[in-house]
Interface confidence: medium
C-alpha cells in the first residue's frame, strides 16, 4: 500500500480555488525527490500539470503553483480559476508518475448555483442553524407571514404565522416576528440536514401587495481533516462543536460501509471494543470543545471520523459534526514492541516501552488506563523520581536499554494488576505506545524469603534462587528506589536446592548486608537481565531493628518471618504469594501526605485482545 | 490555564543568599512537580531543584548542600533558599510546573516568565 496520503474527493465551484494537501513520510530520500501533480487519461496513463522541479503545464499556467513542505512531510498544490472541465481523476505522488508513490485524488466543479436577483445566500454547516430574515412593508405588518421552499416547479409551505409546520421540519423550525418597530420576520432552521439546501422564497401577505424576498440555502457536509499517523503511534482528535451544544452528549463514529457510522466512543459510556485500553475521551469544556486520544494505531483503524453532538451518542440527521480522514502510514518511524506482557501471580514483568531516540533527555512516563467514565490514565511513575504510593517498592522505570527503548519492571504481581498501560514521553512527537499486561497461571521463577528483619550492626545475608533457566543470566541483587534500583554486591553460593528436576545450573545467589544501619531498611530486589535488557524480579523487604544478642543472622527461605499470604512448600521452601507486603513502618512520614490520585483506584479487568506481538514476563 | 509568578530574583553578593518564589494560581487540581530551571546566554535551559507530590526532592549537584527547596502548605507555592551563591549561579530561573492529565494521558508543562539572579565577585 502506498504510503502518500491526501483527500480522496475535493469539490468546488466554476471561478474558485482549491488547495490539495498531500502527505508523505519525511525520509532523507522523500523529502528531496520530485513531487508531482498529475492528470489519470481514458487510457491508464497520468500527464503532469505541475511538479517540484519547476515544470508547469499550459493549462495551469498562471493559476497553479506546488509547495513542498519538506520538515512537514508535505506538500501543497494550489489551483486558482477552476472551470467545469478541470472535473477528473488525479495524483499526486513522489517521483516517476508511473511508480506507484501515489494517491488518488477525484477532482469535482460544479456549476455555480443560477440565483434569482435579489437573492440572498445563506452558506451554513450540517447541523447548525440558519436564520432567514424576511423584511416586509408596513401594509403587511398585519397580514399573513410564510416561508416555502421550492421542489422543482412548485413552492412548498414550509411554516406560516398561523401556526402551519411542514412535517420535514417539525421541532427545528420557528417563525418569529419582531417588535413593532422592526418590519422584519424571520425563520430560524436549527439541526440542518443536506436536504433543507435549496431555494426559498418568504412572504408577507397573499395578494399581489405582498412583500417576497428571496434565500438560498447552502447546507455545508463538513470537509474532513486530513489526519497522517504512524502505524503503532497515536493520534487526537480536537472536537469544537460550538457552546449550543455543550450540554449534548458528544461522540466519536466511524463511518463503515454506506452512511453507517459507528460509535468509537461517547459521552454515554459506550466504548467500540476494539478500542478497549487505548482510547481516552477528555471531558468537555464549556465551550462544548472535547478530544479524543487513540493510541496503538492499527492499519484497520484507518479510515474516516466523525465527531458529533446528538442525544442519543451517535451520528442522527442533523447532528452538528467535524470530519477527519485518518491514514495510518505503515512505513513506521515506531519499532514493534510486545502489545501483551505475561506474568504470573507473585511474579514480575519487566516491558519495553520504545520512544523517539532523537529524544533521549525527554521525561518517560508510564500510566495504567481504566476504562470508567470516559476513560482515564493515571500516572503510575516516571523517570524523574515520581512514584505513586501504593506502586513503592515493586515498580520502576529504567532508561535501558536506551536509544529509543526505556524498560518499566512490576512485581509482587497480583490479579488486579492485570489490564492496559501506556508508555510515552513527554517530547514534541508525543509517542504514545499501548501493552496489556496478563496475569496466568504459574509459578514464581525466583525464590525469596518473604519479609525480614534485620539487627542494627549485625550482618544479614538474604538468598534469591534462581532455577535453571537463567544459568545464562546475569544475576544481581539491587536496593529500590524512587528513582530506579541501585545495583549492590552479591556472591554466588553455588546450586539453588530449591527447585525440583533442576541440575547444577540452578543458583543460590546472595545479598550480604554487613553492619546493618537503619539505612538499609526498605525494598530489595534479585533479579536476571542479559546486558540491558532485564527478565525477571522478586523483592524482599528488609526491616530494621535493635536486638540486645549480638551475632549475624543468615536468612533462609524457611527462616524468614512468615506471612499470611504466604505458602510453606514442602521442600521446607517458602515462596511468596504477595500482595506487597509493607512493613507499617515504611514511609510513614510520606503516607500522611495523601496522595488525591491513589483515592481513585477502581478495579481493573483484563481484556484479552488477542495479539501476535506477546512477551512472557519472564525472559526476553 | 496554570500561570506561574515568580518573584524574588535580583542581585547578591559571591556567598550571600537569595530567596526565589513561585506561585502557581488558574485552574489546579494538583500539581505533580514543582520546579526551578536556570538559563544563560546561548545556553539551554538546565534543572536546578525539583519537588514532587510525595515532598520527594531532588537536586543537581551543583546545588547540592547550597540550594533548599520548600512548599507553602497548600503546594501551589514553591521557594527556593539559595545560599553561598556562586558567579556560576548568575542566570534567568524559571519556575516550573508539571501537571498529569489523567483524562489526556500525558504529562502538562507550564513556564514563568523568569526572574533574573545576578552574582557579583
Known amino acids: 500500500k502506498s504510503p502518500i496520503f491526501g483527500p480522496e474527493e475535493v469539490n468546488s465551484v466554476e471561478g474558485n480555488s482549491v488547495s490539495i494537501t498531500c502527505y508523505y513520510p519525511p525520509t532523507s530520500v522523500n523529502r528531496h525527490t520530485r513531487k508531482y501533480w498529475c492528470r489519470q487519461g481514458a487510457r491508464g496513463g497520468c500527464i503532469t500539470l505541475i511538479s517540484s522541479e519547476g515544470y508547469v503545464s499550459s493549462k495551469y499556467a498562471g493559476r497553479a503553483n506546488l509547495t513542498n513542505f519538506p520538515e512537514n512531510g508535505t506538500f501543497v498544490v494550489n489551483i486558482a480559476q477552476l472551470s467545469q472541465d478541470d472535473s477528473g481523476r488525479y495524483k499526486c505522488g513522489l517521483g516517476i508518475n508511473s511508480r506507484g508513490l501515489s494517491f488518488d485524488v477525484s477532482l469535482e466543479v460544479s456549476q455555480g448555483p443560477g440565483l434569482l436577483n435579489d437573492t440572498k445566500v445563506y452558506t451554513v454547516d450540517l447541523g447548525r442553524t440558519v436564520t432567514i430574515n424576511c423584511p416586509f412593508k408596513t401594509e403587511n405588518a398585519q397580514k399573513r407571514k410564510s416561508l416555502y421552499k421550492q421542489i422543482g416547479l412548485y413552492p412548498v409551505l414550509v411554516i406560516d404565522s398561523s401556526g402551519y409546520v411542514n412535517p420535514n421540519y417539525t421541532g427545528r423550525i420557528r417563525l418569529d416576528i419582531q417588535g413593532t418597530g422592526q418590519l422584519l420576520f424571520s425563520v430560524v432552521i436549527n439541526q440542518l440536514r443536506l436536504s433543507d439546501a435549496g431555494q426559498y422564497l418568504c412572504q408577507a401577505g397573499d395578494d399581489s401587495n405582498s412583500n417576497k424576498k428571496n434565500a438560498d440555502l447552502q447546507v455545508l457536509k463538513p470537509e474532513p481533516e486530513l489526519v497522517y499517523e504512524d502505524l503503532r503511534g497515536s493520534v487526537t482528535f480536537h472536537c469544537a462543536l460550538g457552546p449550543e451544544v455543550a450540554n449534548v452528549a458528544k461522540f466519536l463514529c466511524r463511518q463503515s460501509s454506506g452512511e453507517n457510522c459507528d460509535v468509537v466512543v461517547n459521552t454515554l459510556g459506550k466504548r467500540a471494543p476494539a478500542f478497549e485500553g487505548r482510547i481516552l475521551l477528555n471531558p468537555q469544556d464549556k465551550d462544548g470543545s472535547f478530544s479524543v486520544v487513540i493510541t496503538g494505531l492499527r492499519k484497520e483503524d484507518a479510515g474516516r471520523y466523525l465527531c458529533g453532538a446528538h442525544s442519543d451518542g451517535q451520528l442522527q440527521e442533523g447532528s452538528p459534526i467535524q470530519a477527519w480522514q485518518l491514514f495510518v502510514n505503515e512505513e513506521s518511524t515506531i519499532p514493534r514492541s510486545p502489545t501483551v506482557v505475561k506474568g504470573v501471580a507473585g511474579g514480575s514483568v519487566a516491558v519495553l516501552c520504545p520512544y523517539n531516540r532523537k529524544e533521549s533527555k525527554s521525561i518517560k512516563y508510564w500510566c495504567l488506563w481504566e476504562g470508567a467514565q470516559n476513560g482515564r490514565c493515571p500516572l503510575l511513575v516516571d523517570s524523574e523520581g515520581w512514584v505513586k504510593a501504593q506502586y513503592e517498592g515493586r515498580l520502576s522505570l529504567l532508561e535501558e536499554p536506551g536509544n529509543g527503548t526505556f524498560t518499566v519492571i512490576l512485581n509482587q504481581l497480583t490479579s488486579r494488576d492485570a489490564g492496559f498501560y501506556w508508555c510515552l514521553t513527554n517530547g514534541d512527537t508525543l509517542w504514545r505506545t499501548t501493552v496489556e499486561i496478563k496475569i496466568i497461571e504459574g509459578e514464581p521463577n525466583l525464590k525469596v524469603p518473604g519479609n525480614v528483619t534485620a539487627v542494627l550492626g549485625e550482618t544479614l545475608k538474604v538468598p534469591c534462587h534462581f532455577p535453571c533457566k537463567f544459568s545464562s543470566y546475569e544475576k544481581y541483587w539491587c536496593k529500590w528506589n524512587n528513582t530506579g534500583c541501585q545495583a549492590l554486591p552479591s556472591q554466588d553460593e553455588g546450586p539453588s536446592k530449591a527447585f525440583v528436576n533442576c541440575d547444577e545450573n540452578s543458583r543460590l545467589v546472595s545479598l550480604t548486608l554487613n553492619l546493618v544501619t537503619r539505612a538499609d531498611e526498605g525494598w530489595y530486589w534479585c533479579g536476571v537481565k542479559q546486558g540491558h535488557f532485564y527478565g525477571e524480579t522478586a523483592a524482599v523487604y528488609v526491616a530494621v531493628e535493635e536486638r540486645k544478642a549480638a551475632g549475624s543472622r543468615d536468612v533462609s527461605l524457611a527462616k524468614a518471618d512468615a506471612a499470611p499470604d504466604e505458602k510453606v512448600l514442602d521442600s521446607g521452601f517458602r515462596e511468596i504469594e504477595n500482595k506487597a507486603i509493607q512493613d507499617p513502618r515504611l514511609f510513614a512520614e510520606e503516607k500522611a501526605v495523601a496522595d488525591t490520585r491513589d483515592q481513585a483506584d477502581g478495579s481493573r479487568a483484563s481484556v484479552d485482545s488477542g495479539s501476535s506481538e506477546e512477551q512472557g514476563g519472564s525472559s526476553r | 490555564e496554570v500561570q506561574l509568578v515568580e518573584s524574588g530574583g535580583g542581585l547578591a553578593q559571591a556567598g550571600g543568599s537569595l530567596r526565589l518564589s513561585c506561585t502557581a494560581s488558574?485552574?489546579?487540581?494538583?500539581?505533580?512537580?514543582m520546579a526551578w530551571y536556570r538559563q544563560t546566554p546561548g545556553n539551554e535551559r538546565e534543572l536546578v531543584a525539583r519537588?514532587?507530590?510525595?515532598?520527594?526532592?531532588h537536586y543537581v549537584d551543583s546545588a547540592k548542600g547550597r540550594f533548599t527547596l520548600s512548599r507553602a502548605q497548600d503546594k501551589n507555592t514553591v521557594d527556593l533558599q539559595m545560599n553561598s551563591l556562586e558567579p556560576d549561579d548568575a542566570a534567568v530561573y524559571y519556575c516550573?510546573?508539571?501537571?498529569?492529565?489523567?483524562?489526556?494521558?500525558?504529562?502538562?508543562?507550564?513556564w514563568g516568565q523568569g526572574t533574573l539572579v545576578t552574582v557579583s565577585s
Open positions: 488558574g485552574t489546579i487540581s494538583k500539581i505533580d512537580v
Open positions: 516550573n510546573a508539571q501537571i498529569w492529565s489523567d483524562m489526556r494521558g500525558r504529562m502538562d508543562t507550564y
Open positions: 519537588i514532587f507530590s510525595n515532598d520527594v526532592t
